[in-house]
């Protein structure tokens, strides 16, 4: 679709004369008619197939045509087609004297014409205005004309209709030759999808306005390049979604099991070394001078009652030191100037000389320690309870209160509540520090894997096109993870199905 | 070939909320040439544009109706939905949906073929 | 608000052409769709992009689309040819249809 422009500009008839020689009475009031047709080698009378157009009186004689565009758009005149422009014309333009006002060809005597000019040639589609003048005997015609496209129309030819738009049919304008020209942020055949954020990830993002990305399920982040791990997963990455793949010193289905507790928690004070014993459990190995289940106390190191045969003990700044009762020397009190003969063994103990009488060695009753007896026997002074027991003197014994979880005589075993196998279907037992926890094998639930529950979602293998299936555990149910070109829950259909009708 | 299928209740109560899903066969709903779209026509009326939906969830709403209209869309079972809230007598038409193409410049080359709802006590 | 107009009703003898307008402001710069529906079913697309057919519709319609008209043309009209026609377009993203035209074949 488009017009043929035909701008007349000056019309020259000095003796206002007819076609026939004879003149205008009293001058030639000239209006023009114009026949636009296919192309003729030789231009003949006929239809005007491509259209006609008919001027008022412009002038009489000879004089310039203005140029009444804005006007009534009188000049340029115009030919409209509803065609592909063929490239190709024929061309006739003819002058007329009105001797009234009535302009209809039937109304005219056929002696009317001034003069007819007809041409015909090739004619691009453009902006450019092509000049031309015609000169008969009498008269002489100066005019330009030119094909452009109606609005909307492009292309060589003006066969190519194309409407600008900017909805979510398309965000396009239209290039000289038809084709749409994306706005910026969008892209598609016809500029219906919008170009994401830069980076956003191509299979798990997309956007549904330029510059942004929205993340399919399972993924996250600002590009939707991370993945979203199993809900409730503490210590825990993943490396595609729903999976909880414990980090360094964790366990457990969400890695909210403490297997470094030293680590994590640094609970020996002072210097300790820590080791590990068990989920959630540790031992502190103290320095010299610091006890307690986290060498948290500090030892005066008159504790230990270094100073034997009844000797005192002074705390010093830079250790201890022990004042002798008489008979005894020595830097622990250790050595006697005392004899059987003295009677040094107290608490009823048996004295026995050594040494051809130069010293002697008091064995002692039940109870009762020291080089002289003299000693009452805390047994709780060498930490027997291990794992933090707590150490009781219970008269000629001892014995030690556990903590949770331990047991013995030294709390040195680790009560397993696993040793029952609780576990049903199979199920895998880990000791907790208040109790135990099972690890359910896939179709089973409950806190002793005792419920039956579905199976894996990803089993019946439901995603096509080779993507990739990735089990919700909290929901039972899939996910597919497109490969790029296919859509849809389980990856079936390929992207832009050919067109296609109901009819 | 493509079929449409509205179903939902017929009859709703005034000031409830009005819900319809349009079940799509014979193509894929995440194609990106297409659009998904809800239209309505009064008893002896002409035909109202209400909304439509891309497979990514973006929607467009008629403005008259948008305080009150959302369209959702779940790939996995190849449907859209309508929901209309504070439904009143004035929404008793036959709701129809539609498969809006982009290649068609936005015409609707698929329709169901409609259900009647009522807004009645 | 945008709005399309179409005259409420056309009649038209077997065998003759009958035209059916479609008027709005600037509409020739939006691409016109055109749809038949007769009673009891759903509407039918005849016609998008402003003078394009779908396969399956009859060649005697036509359309054209220039200025603030859409005219939807049918040539050598038929008695089938009877029902209510629509004319529908997008104004930004919101879509518009007119009020419909009920075609009579005398």
């Known amino acids: 679709s488009g017009v043929f422009q035909l701008q007349l500009q000056e019309f020259i008839n000095e003796r206002g004369v007819l076609a026939s020689g004879r003149p205008c009475e009293p001058g030639c009031r000239t209006f023009f008619r114009v026949c636009l047709k296919h192309f003729q080698a030789v231009v003949s009378p006929g239809p005007c197939t491509f259209g006609t157009v008919s001027t008022p009186v412009l002038g009489t004689n000879s004089f310039a045509v203005r140029d009444d565009s804005s006007g009534g758009g009188r000049n340029p005149l115009q030919l409209p087609f509803n065609f592909t422009w063929p490239g190709t014309f024929s061309l006739i333009i003819e002058a007329w004297h009105a001797p009234g006002d009535d302009l209809r060809p039937e109304a005219l005597p056929p002696d009317a014409l001034i003069s007819k000019i007809a041409i015909q040639g090739s004619l691009a589609v453009g902006q450019n205005w092509l000049l031309d003048e015609q000169t008969s005997t009498l008269t002489r015609l100066r005019y330009s004309y030119r094909v452009i496209c109606s609005d909307n129309y492009y292309g060589d030819n003006c066969s190519r209709l194309c409407k600008k738009r900017n909805d979510h049919f398309g965000h396009y304008v239209c290039q000289p030759d038809g084709n749409l020209s994306c706005l910026p942020g969008w892209t598609g055949e016809y500029c219906q999808q919008p170009i994401c954020l830069s980076g956003c990830h191509e299979q798990n993002g997309y956007c549904s306005k330029p510059a942004e990305c929205l993340c399919r399920p399972g993924w996250q982040g600002r590009l939707c390049n991370e993945c979203i791990p199993h809900n409730g997963c503490r210590h825990g990455t993943c490396s595609t979604p729903w999976q909880c793949t414990c980090d360094e010193g964790w366990g457990g289905l969400f890695c909210d099991q403490d297997l470094n507790y030293c680590t994590h928690h640094s609970p020996c004070k002072n210097g300790a070394t820590c080791s590990n014993s068990g989920q959630r459990s540790y031992t502190c190995t103290c320095r010299p001078g610091y006890t307690g289940v986290d060498c948290e106390l500090e030892l005066s190191e008159c504790d230990s009652n270094p100073c034997r045969n009844g000797g005192s003990c002074k705390d010093q700044e830079d250790g201890y030191h022990c004042l002798c009762p008489p008979g005894y020397y020595g830097l622990h009190c250790e050595h006697s100037t005392l004899s059987c003969a003295d009677s040094p063994c107290f608490n009823g103990g048996s004295c026995r000389e050594r040494n051809q009488g130069a010293n002697y060695a008091c064995e002692c009753p039940p109870n009762f320690t020291g080089s002289n007896c003299e000693k009452k026997v805390d047994r709780c002074t060498s930490n027997p309870c291990a794992n933090g027991g707590q150490c009781l003197n219970r008269g000629p014994s001892r014995m030690c209160r556990c903590r949770p979880g331990f047991t013995g005589t030294y709390c040195e075993l680790h009560v397993s509540d696993c040793a029952r196998n609780p576990c049903a279907h199979g199920g895998t037992c880990h000791d907790l520090e208040n109790g135990l926890m099972c690890t359910c094998p896939a179709g089973f639930s409950g806190r002793r894997c005792e419920v039956r529950t579905s199976i894996d979602a990803c089993a019946s293998s439901p995603c096509f096109n080779r993507a990739t299936c990735y089990t919700d555990l909290s929901t039972d149910t899939f996910v597919c993870n497109c490969p790029y070109g296919f859509v849809g829950s389980r990856c079936e259909f390929p992207v832009g199905l050919p067109p296609s009708f109901p009819w | 070939e493509v079929q449409l299928q509205e179903s939902g209740p017929g009859l709703v109560k005034p000031s409830e909320t009005l819900s319809l899903t349009c079940t799509v066969s014979?193509?894929?709903?995440?194609?990106?040439?297409?659009?998904w779209g809800w239209i309505r026509q009064s008893p002896g009326k002409g035909l109202e544009w209400i909304g439509d939906i891309y497979y990514t969830g973006s929607t467009y709403y008629n403005p008259s109706l948008k305080s009150r209209v959302t369209i959702s869309v779940d790939t996995s079972k190849n449907q859209f939905s309508l929901k209309l809230s504070s439904v009143t007598a004035e929404d008793t038409a036959v709701y129809y949906c539609?498969?809006?193409?982009?290649?068609?410049?936005?015409?609707?080359?698929?329709w169901g073929q409609g259900t009647l709802v009522t807004v009645s006590s | 608000s945008y709005e399309l107009t179409q005259p409420p009703s056309v009649s038209v003898s077997p065998g003759q052409t009958a035209s059916i307008t479609c008027s709005g402001q600037r509409l020739g710069d939006k691409y016109a769709s055109w749809y038949q529906q007769k009673p009891g079913q759903s509407p039918v697309l005849v016609i998008y992009e402003d003078s394009k057919r779908p396969s399956g519709i009859p060649e005697r319609f036509s359309g054209s689309n220039s200025g603030d008209t859409a005219t939807l043309t049918i040539s050598g009209t038929q008695p089938m040819d009877e029902a209510d026609y629509y004319c529908?377009?997008?104004?930004?993203?919101?879509?518009?249809f007119g009020y419909g035209t009920k075609v009579t074949v005398l």
């Open positions: 539609a498969r809006e193409d982009v290649i068609l410049r936005g015409g609707s080359d698929y």
């Open positions: 529908q377009a997008w104004d930004r993203d919101t879509g518009v």
């Open positions: 014979g193509g894929s709903i995440s194609n990106s040439r297409y659009h």
